[in-house]
């Protein structure tokens, strides 16, 4: 290994020696989170007995990634908290390699192997322990955490049970060969959740798949109640590193989420990209196209970087119920290029949503179905009805144009209105399909300040029904 | 028994430089980090900083950057402040803490401070 | 940075009373709050970590509460001992930041 170990305090020809010295071990036991000292060593059990490591459980490392603090941050501490509070007797090893992680950004990528070999050659000595099973072992990795994992599970003799990869790092690590970041190949199953990744600029999260299942929430980009104005509310002096921070810690919060609130789980849905997920296309839980997120991620039989969407609130518990809805417009006027804004509200046995705006990503299509995509954060239980709105200040300057232009050329004025007969909707959490009746069926058009009210009419679609998340996973 | 142990009072005249220092016992040194404290006369607690002795590593407030240098003898298991061009502000007393490498972990031991005077 | 108020700089009890102290965040500190004792002769000692979790050696007679941004220190059976300067700090955000401290003299 060539690569320069600690930003020039120690350079590496004798690259893993050095690393050892720079790659510590704290094993975090149940039993006593707060000891002090319970570093593990290649080549010295005395701190295993010392510690109460349970040799038969599972064995999770979390590795950090690159600190500007040289401390371990807060993330960490509420992690190591959930996992013992979900698995009560496995072990916990916080993987410090501060020094070298400590250092330029440039310098700690190049130390990213060295470390993974160290993570890898401490798996290879507990191997030869009686009762401890590589496939018991889960690494979790952060960041620039989440290479070294992949590194490591690439250098162990044998196959770790597991990776998930925190929103791992981007610079230096977009595009580039599977043997130098992670990749489906390090473990038997590697999850990844990808927070903050971006087409411009900087993208700090890997933007490709690097998993067996690449979990990309409200799209991997901008996550909620991580916006500039949220920050700067919440912060006396917020500035972008903030948000920065925010979104791509966001990974680690989700991931928190999905061990302690067992209860609230939240599923995630295979699609192609963000933007046909953004149209309520891809809620099928069909042939494994659903899944849970973070440490409810089940390994499933599809083949590797399958790209996977859902939405979230904006802090625990994340999970949101997301609906498709399928609406077709009927046009029986000449109503010209229309971009009107809708607006529904879900009423169910539970309670009634907020007033849900329903996201056009094109454009409507007039006479066609569109679908659409609208979650609550609460759980409405049945759905019972759904109030559409039409807003009444939705016409564009061009529309404003065009309207009068025609009204000068014809002589009657072209009417806004549209025809709506029933709205279909599918839960992805029950994959429940339900259609909806507007109450008379010769009231049918609505036009823009307008309201129409649909009534649960008929269970699914006259189609067959798909299985349910909680029954596939 | 945990113990932080400080070096003595101090007097010296305005951009003078001065050095305290941290003596620990009764723990691994290189288990936990250092943090240092200033407390103004009949003031607040401000943190200055801290080293992780370790490997070296150092972090400190912006306010105190071109201030305090931070330092470690590992083989003495003593930490170092090092204060520069002082002024009459820089007239304290300053606590050493030990503190465990998380965010997290509190200031569980401290020294019992070391009072620094600033004066023509 | 995280500014800590406490809003109470001077407060007089008597032997044997159950006294507060409050400390409140700029904002959410995820519960990331220890609190300090300062005596005269400026020996500072570590009660409470973590909102609530009392320190080894230190008596039960101290606790803590709070979540988001209020936080508080009660002590139950007040001692002679216990009259002294408190200071809260938080550990959630660098740089770490303590109150302005509420001194408890004895009435």
């Known amino acids: 290994a060539e690569e320069q170990l600690e930003g020039g305090l120690r350079t590496a020809k004798d690259g893993p020696a050095a690393a050892k010295a720079a790659v510590r071990f704290h094993l975090r036991t149940s039993k006593g989170p707060e000891r002090e000292g319970c570093y593990l060593s290649v080549g010295h059990s005395q701190p295993l007995e010392d510690c109460s490591f349970n040799m038969t459980a599972k064995t999770f490392f979390i590795i950090h990634g690159w600190t500007m603090s040289g401390m371990l941050e807060n993330w960490l501490h509420k992690l190591v908290s959930a996992l013992q509070m979900r698995e009560k007797d496995a072990n916990v090893v916080v993987v410090d390699w501060l020094p070298l992680a400590h250092q330029l950004y440039t310098d700690a990528v190049n130390s990213t192997r060295v470390v993974g070999l160290s993570v890898a050659k401490m798996l290879d000595w507990l191997q030869g322990k009686d009762g401890f099973s590589l496939g018991n072992v889960h690494l979790i990795g952060y960041s620039l955490g989440a290479h070294v994992a992949g590194f490591a599970g690439n250098f162990v003799k044998g196959t770790v049970g597991r990776i998930t990869g925190l929103d791992p790092a981007g610079p230096m690590f977009e595009g580039v060969d599977i043997h130098r970041r992670l990749s489906p190949d390090d473990a038997d199953f590697v999850d990844v959740l990808h927070t903050y990744t971006r087409s411009f600029g900087i993208s700090i999260g890997i933007q490709m798949p690097v998993g067996h299942i690449d979990i990309y929430p409200n799209g991997g980009d901008f996550q909620p109640g991580c916006g500039l104005n949220d920050v700067l509310g919440s912060i006396a002096y917020g500035t972008i590193a903030e948000v920065v921070k925010c979104e791509h810690e966001r990974a680690v919060h989700l991931f928190v989420d999905s061990l302690v609130n067992q209860d609230k789980p939240s599923f995630a849905f295979q699609c192609t990209d963000s933007n046909r997920f953004k149209k309520g296309i891809c809620l099928s839980c069909r042939k494994n196209r659903c899944n849970g997120i973070g440490y409810n991620a089940k390994k499933t039989r599809n083949k590797r970087n399958t790209k996977m969407y859902l939405k979230t609130r904006a802090g625990m518990p994340f999970r949101v119920y997301h609906y498709q809805m399928k609406i077709h417009f009927f046009s029986y006027k000449s109503v010209g290029a229309i971009e009107p804004t809708f607006y529904v509200t879900l009423y169910g046995t539970n309670a009634e949503s907020q007033v849900l705006s329903l996201e056009i990503v094109e454009q409507i299509g007039l006479n066609a179905t569109n679908t659409f995509l609208v979650y609550t954060e609460e759980d409405l239980g049945d759905l019972l009805k759904i109030k559409l709105t039409w807003e009444g200040t939705s016409r564009s300057w061009y529309d404003l144009w065009r309207e009068f232009r025609s009204y000068l050329s014809q002589p009657h004025r072209p009417e806004r209105e549209l025809s709506i007969r029933r709205i279909r909707v599918k839960s992805g959490e029950t994959q429940r399909r339900l259609t909806f009746c507007v109450e008379d069926p010769e009231k049918t058009s609505i036009a823009p300040g307008q309201e129409l009210w649909f009534y649960k009419c008929r269970d699914g679609w006259r189609m067959k029904n798909e299985t349910s998340p909680t029954v596939e996973l | 028994e945990v113990q932080l142990q400080q070096s003595g009072p101090e007097l010296l005249k305005p951009g003078a430089s001065v050095k305290i220092s941290c003596k620990a016992s009764?723990?691994?040194?290189?288990?936990?980090?250092i943090h240092w404290v200033k407390q103004s006369h009949g003031k607040s607690l401000e943190w200055i900083g801290h080293?992780?002795?370790?490997?070296?590593?150092?972090n400190n407030n912006e306010k105190f950057k071109d201030k305090a240098t931070l330092t470690v003898d590992k083989s003495s298991s003593t930490a170092y402040m090092e204060l520069r061009s002082l002024t009459s502000e820089d007239s304290a007393i300053y606590y050493c803490?030990?503190?465990?490498?998380?965010?997290?972990?509190?200031?569980?031991?401290w020294g019992q401070g070391t009072t620094l005077t600033v004066s023509s | 940075d995280i500014q800590m108020t406490q809003t109470t700089s001077s407060l007089s009890a008597s032997l044997g009373d159950r006294v507060t102290i409050s400390c409140r965040a700029s904002?959410?500190?995820?519960?990331?709050l220890n609190w300090y004792q300062q005596k005269p002769d400026g020996t500072v000692k570590l009660l409470i970590s973590?909102?609530?979790k009392l320190h080894s050696g230190v008596p039960s007679r101290f606790s803590g509460s709070g979540s988001g941004t209020d936080y508080s220190l009660t002590i139950s059976n007040l001692e002679r001992e216990d009259f002294a300067t408190y200071f809260c700090?938080?550990?959630?955000?660098?740089?770490?930041?303590f109150g302005s401290g509420t001194n408890l003299e004895i009435k």
């Open positions: 803490a030990r503190k465990g490498i998380y965010y997290s972990s509190p200031f569980d031991y």
């Open positions: 009764g723990y691994t040194f290189t288990d936990n980090t």
């Open positions: 080293i992780n002795p370790y490997y070296g590593g150092t």
């Open positions: 904002q959410d500190i995820n519960n990331y």
């Open positions: 973590y909102t609530s």
């Open positions: 700090q938080q550990g959630n955000t660098l740089p770490f930041t």
